[in-house]
């Protein structure tokens, strides 16, 4: 029997992605354990195999069908559980009635380019990857620059409360290098969370022309 | 370990009540959920009701919604079903049932429960 406290969190990325993460305090790590999808209103079921993370947390994802596929929609309700292997049977060790558009999670923006770069500014434009057409345009962006000398985590948060996939960033140091990340998050739901940062995009400023003497 | 024992069971006319007990002992505090099943001759056990840890959820069977009712007494370790309105299909085996697996469901089904009572007999005749 396992004792301690027990998390099971898991997040739909909008297309056919249910990605989970359970932990458990005392559990062993050896343990054979699995999650597994029996959605309400669908004919299909799906099992993913949870891999040890860190010492007590185990994740896995739930691959729906192709990556762009819509497998599940606003009405759909899929009962998710946490399944460990003890001896010859399988112990259910949590479970919850999961609405996937109430807990989305899209996959980190793509395709970072840099459009324009100048001495103090720079045009930047991205794609978002798996995202449901159920959004239309409701999604938003955070966006952060990270300077030289600085971290990430100092990093000024810029926000774009609209569906606007490319940024002018502006007073810039010439000559300077950069590198800039942004997320997407959803308006819809409940327990939405912002995706993961993009990959670091990194630029540098044009040099500050040489000015003429007068 | 965990024991459930049921009581409450017997022979009653149609249109009448019943009230279901279960006793827990052991290592109560492991328990999440509790619920009933039943089992019809020759059938497998089938869902009955649910109640979550602090009673705040419960669930039914389409069947016996309206007419019964789960609840639990914590502090005595009991989970009960009354049953009103009893009808000759009601007739089965019924056994108490206990989880410790984290979280609800309103789509219980018979191996999301680890603990199991003996079952007591409900006999509804007309």
């Known amino acids: 029997a396992v004792n301690g406290t027990s998390q099971f969190t898991c997040f739909y990325n909008s297309r056919a992605n249910i990605s989970c993460v359970w932990s458990q305090d005392g559990a062993l790590q050896d343990t054979s354990c699995q999650v597994h999808a029996w959605p309400d209103r669908r004919r299909w079921n799906q099992t993913c195999e949870l891999l040890p993370v860190s010492q007590a947390s185990w994740a896995c994802n739930l691959i729906l069908g192709a990556p762009d596929s819509q497998k599940l929609t606003t009405v759909d309700i899929v009962t998710l559980r946490v399944l460990c292997r003890e001896g010859v049977r399988w112990r259910v060790m949590a479970i919850q009635d999961f609405k996937p558009f109430e807990n989305l999670r899209l996959m980190a923006p793509i395709s970072l380019q840099v459009v324009h770069v100048e001495t103090h500014r720079c045009n930047i434009s991205w794609e978002i990857s798996q995202a449901s057409h159920y959004f239309e345009r409701h999604l938003e962006f955070e966006a952060r620059t990270l300077s030289p000398g600085h971290t990430w985590e100092e990093a000024p948060l810029l926000t774009l409360k609209q569906k606007q996939e490319w940024i002018c960033l502006e007073t810039l140091t010439p000559d300077t290098q950069y590198e800039f990340q942004v997320r997407v998050k959803p308006l819809q739901g409940e327990f939405t969370t912002w995706s993961p940062w993009s990959q670091p995009l990194a630029f540098r400023t044009k040099p500050a022309a040489l000015g003429k003497d007068t | 370990q965990l024991q459930l024992v049921e009581s409450g069971g017997g022979l009653v006319q149609t249109g009448t009540s019943l009230r279901l007990s279960c006793a827990a002992s052991?290592?109560?505090?492991?328990?999440?959920?509790m619920g009933w099943f039943r089992q019809f001759p020759g059938k497998e056990r089938e869902f009955v009701a649910a109640?979550?840890?602090?009673?705040?959820?419960?669930v039914y069977v389409d069947s016996v919604k309206g007419r019964f009712t789960i609840s639990r007494d914590n502090a005595k370790s009991t989970v009960y079903l009354q049953m009103n309105s009893l009808k000759p299909e009601d007739t089965a085996v019924y056994y108490c049932t206990a989880t410790d697996a984290v979280g609800w469901t309103t789509r219980w089904m018979t191996a999301d429960f680890g603990f199991w009572g003996q079952g007591t007999q409900v006999t509804v005749s007309s």
């Open positions: 109640i979550s840890r602090n009673g705040g959820s419960t």
């Open positions: 052991g290592h109560t505090s492991r328990i999440n959920a």
